[in-house]
Amino acid sequence: GIAIPRNSGCPNSEDKNFPRTVMVNLNIHNRNTSTNPKRSSDYYNRSTSPWNLHRNEDPERYPSVIWEAKCRHLGCVKADGNVDYHMNSVPIQQEILVLRREPRHCPNSFRLEKILVSVGCTCVTPIVHHVA
Amino acid sequence: GIAIPRNSGCPNSEDKNFPRTVMVNLNIHNRNTSTNPKRSSDYYNRSTSPWNLHRNEDPERYPSVIWEAKCRHLGCVKADGNVDYHMNSVPIQQEILVLRREPRHCPNSFRLEKILVSVGCTCVTPIVHHVA
C-alpha cells in the first residue's frame, strides 16, 4: 500500500499503510449544494432513446433502493413518433460504489462493492459488419 | 431510529440503534462478474448526442478518479453528420456515493458523500415555451 499523509488528529489504525478496514461516517454530506432544476427528471420521456425506470431493493445493500434504466425500444424515436430501427437505443452504464452488509444483517459492518447500473439511454449509430 | 436485525457474528457497536459510524472493508467486491463487451465504451462517439470524458481527480476522495461526461454539442448529430439544433444534447446525471477523507489526509477515516456526476448524454426534444 501507499502511505497517505497523516493528520495527527486521525483515529488510530494498526496498519499505517492504506487500511483494508476503515471507519465511515454514514451522515451523508451532499456536495450538490442547490437542487438543479435542469436535472434529468423528465429526460427519460423526452429522449429519442426513452427509458423506463425499474426499482431494485436489497436491504443488505447501502443504498437499499436503486432505480435502474431500461431502454424502451431497440431503435430510436423519430420526430414523427415512430421508431427508427436503423439506429439503436443503448443503456449508458456506470460502475458505482455501494456498501454490502458483511456479515449479513450487521448494522455496523460493511464491505465496499462495485456494481454496474444503467443510468439512462442514448441513441447510437449501429456498428455494421460487412461480409466479404 | 430502528435497531437492525443483528447477526451474532457482527462486530460490536456501542450504539445498538442505527450507527452513524460503521466499519467498511475496502477490499472491493466486484459484482459485475464478466466484463461486458457491450459496455458504453464507444457510445460516446457513436451517439447522436456525443460526449467527451473529463478526468476529475481528488486525492481526498475514494475513488480518487472519476470520469465525467460533457456533451459535445448543444444539438444532436443527424445521419449526415450535421448538428440539428431543433433537438438538444443533454447530460444524464446520477447521484453517486463516494468516501471523503475526514479529517483530511486521514488514511482510515471517511465520511460518506453524495456527488452528482454526468455519465453520458442523450438527445431530447426541447421544451418549447409558447408566448401568449
Epitope: 451532499n30 437542487t35 433502493v65 | -
Partner: antibody
Framework: QVQLQQSGAELVRPGTSVTLSCKAS????????IHWIKQTPAQVLEWIGV????????LHNPKFDGKATLTADKSSRTAYMELRSLTSEDSAVYYC??????????????WGQGTSVTVSS | QIVLTQSPAIMSAFPGEKVTMTCSAS?????MCWYQQKPGTSPKRWIC???KLASGVPVRFSGSGSGTSYSLTINSMETEDAATYYC?????????FGGGTKVEIK
Amino acid sequence: QVQLQQSGAELVRPGTSVTLSCKASGYRFTDYEIHWIKQTPAQVLEWIGVTDPESGGTLHNPKFDGKATLTADKSSRTAYMELRSLTSEDSAVYYCTRYYKYESFYGMDYWGQGTSVTVSS
Amino acid sequence: QIVLTQSPAIMSAFPGEKVTMTCSASSSISYMCWYQQKPGTSPKRWICDTSKLASGVPVRFSGSGSGTSYSLTINSMETEDAATYYCQQRSSYPWTFGGGTKVEIK
C-alpha cells in the same frame, strides 16, 4: 422537524379527475421515495405505488394502473398523485409517506395527515 | 400478490394483560412491518424488519416471526395501546397490508 403536508379534502363528481399534493419539509427530499397509500371507508389499507423524486421513477400497484399517476417536483419538494375517471370506489383517505432509500429497514417512517376524497354526484 | 391475514380482527384486554396478534402471509416473506393507527389519525410506524421497535415505541411491544407466520405482542397492555395494528410486507410487489387487528381496553 419532518413534515408531509397534504392538500385539503376534495368533493368531486364521478368521471372527473383530482390531483392531491404532498409537500415535504425538514429532510433531504431526494434521499427518500414517496409512497401513496389508500385507506377505504372500511379501514382497509392499500399500497398505490411509489415515486422517486431523484430519478423520476415510479412503480404502481397493478390495481391502480390507469387510475393513479404519481409525480414529484424537486424544486418545490412536492409529490403529486392524480386520480382519474373517479367513481364511488375511489372515495377514501389517501396518505403520502416517505421511505428512506439508503436503509430500507426504516420502513415508511413519516406519514402525511391524509387527504379525504369523496366522489359524489 | 401476497395476502396478509391478521387475527383476531378484534380483541379486548384488561390493563396489564399480555396481548398477542398474528399475521399470516400467503407466501414466505423476509421481513414484516407493523403500523399502529388510532381513530382520526395517520398510521404510525411501530415495528419494522419483524422485531425492531421504532423510536418512541414502549419496550412492552415486541415482534417476531419468519416465513409465513409473524406476531406482535404487548407484554402488559396499557390504555394508550388501544388502537388498530396493521402488518405490512415489502418482500414482493405490490406491497400489501393485513386487514388489521383492533385492540380495545376492557
